[in-house]
């Protein structure tokens, strides 16, 4: 799939209609949308491609990454390659600050969750962040979904402020990350 | 780029103890387990256990049980594996491997042959 | 322990030549499968992770594909450098394990 990457027109995209009719609880029936349709609008400043920057357009810049946060609904298996063909992973939170970034973000749509890059085989395997990195729930607490009809929650998601486990199979948005190096 | 650099090559008797070193450098040590994988001569892979460099958890191989020991020490960067009880069939080439994307062993050691003979 | 067996055991071929390994799990493992190729008195080396995700640096000559049980590891043309033996690593419960491998020789 191409990337095309879209300028920010500067006006409040919070007001283009979005998030209309696309609901945590109500994933039934998702549209297919370009990649180019299906980023986030955000309050957070984007870049515009008008400077340099290092991030593309219409990323959000915080510290040392840029964000995508993507509208098109997919698995968690299918978030992560979309990350990759636009050259970037599912969110890792690396800090406590990053953190508080991401749930600032997410938490102005309260109807949506975001796919991050956290996952693990089934319940008896430690969560792993994509890169194969170990999880630390120094960090943040993973509230768990399960239940005796769907016992193997093995993906996470963050919800406004919370960051709960679910089925992987089960469709959502999701957070791009693409780090540079300044 | 990331490295890891194992201990030398060692001889020992039935019933003694190994313990092989494994030094990271290229990337953040307490961030990725540990991997330990031996392979005897002539033969196949064998995964032995993991140990978190970051909160020293591990996690054994029912095989070794009892007589595996994982160890780390984070301000040099090194991982250990020791080895009690030795058998002649515990002959092997001992690797450790940093963990990667979907637990899978992306970093590899060169390699410590252990040889138990009497 | 989940059993991992590969087919063929060996097999010889030809530069250019397309190779397929399969790589069956005794049980399903989702797409937590690895794939490894191996050289006399070298360690390892990762080629694909998550079953058909490849490793950076890794030639786009090489490509898993399956889930659950049954995966393959495909060659698309055989290079002079590729003559090894591959292993494919399940990592879906403890202990992880490997299959006992593929021998790919000259033929």
């Known amino acids: 799939t191409m990337a095309i990457w879209r300028s920010n027109s500067g006006s409040n995209t919070l007001e283009n209609g979005y998030f209309l009719s696309r609901n945590k609880e109500n994933h039934s029936q998702p549209t297919q949308s370009s990649l180019e349709d299906s980023v986030t609008p955000t309050k957070a400043v984007k870049t515009t491609g008008v400077l340099s920057s290092p991030c593309p357009p219409n990323w959000i810049i915080y510290e040392k990454s840029c964000y995508l946060f993507s509208m098109s609904l997919n698995s968690w298996d299918g978030s992560k390659r979309q990350c990759w063909q636009l050259g970037s992973n599912l969110l890792k939170i690396d800090s406590s600050n990053e953190l508080g970034f991401i749930v600032k973000q997410v938490s102005s749509q309260p109807d949506n969750s975001f796919w991050i890059g956290l996952s693990r085989p089934q319940t008896e395997v430690p969560w792993l962040w994509e890169d194969g990195s170990t999880f630390s729930s120094n960090l943040f607490q993973i509230r768990t979904t399960a239940t005796q009809e769907n016992p193997s929650p093995n993906c996470v998601w963050i919800h406004v402020s919370v960051i709960y486990d679910q089925l992987c199979s089960v469709p959502s948005y999701s957070i791009c990350e693409k780090k540079f190096s300044m | 780029q990331v490295q890891l650099v194992q201990s030398g090559a060692e001889v020992k008797k039935p019933g003694a103890s190994v313990k092989v070193s494994c030094k990271s450098s290229?990337?953040?040590?307490?961030?990725?387990?540990i991997h330990w994988v031996r392979q005897a001569p002539g033969q196949g892979l064998e995964w032995m256990g993991w140990?978190?460099?970051?909160?020293?958890?591990?996690n054994y191989a029912q095989k070794f049980q009892g007589r595996i020991t994982m160890t780390r020490d984070t301000s040099i960067s090194t991982a250990y594996l020791e080895l009690s009880r030795l058998r002649s069939d515990d002959t092997a080439v001992f690797y450790c491997?940093?963990?990667?994307?979907?637990?899978?062993?992306?970093?590899w050691g060169q390699g410590t042959l252990v040889t138990v003979s009497s | 322990d989940i059993q991992m067996t590969q087919s063929p055991s060996s097999v010889s071929a030809s530069v250019g030549d397309r190779v397929t390994i399969t790589c069956r799990a005794s049980?399903?493992?989702?797409?937590?499968l690895a794939w490894y190729q191996q050289k006399p008195g070298k360690a390892p080396k990762l080629l694909i992770f998550?079953?058909?995700s490849l490793q950076s640096g890794v030639p786009s000559r090489f490509s898993g594909s399956g889930s659950g049980t049954d995966f393959t590891l495909t060659v698309s043309s055989l290079q002079p450098e590729d003559f090894a033996t591959y292993y494919c690593?399940?990592?879906?419960?403890?202990?992880?394990?490997f299959g006992p491998g593929t021998k790919v020789d000259i033929e």
């Open positions: 491997a940093r963990n990667s994307g979907s637990y899978s062993f992306g970093y």
């Open positions: 290229g990337y953040t040590f307490t961030a990725y387990y």
């Open positions: 140990i978190n460099p970051n909160s020293g958890d591990t």
């Open positions: 049980q399903g493992i989702s797409s937590w």
């Open positions: 998550g079953a058909s």
């Open positions: 690593q399940q990592a879906y419960s403890f202990p992880f394990t």
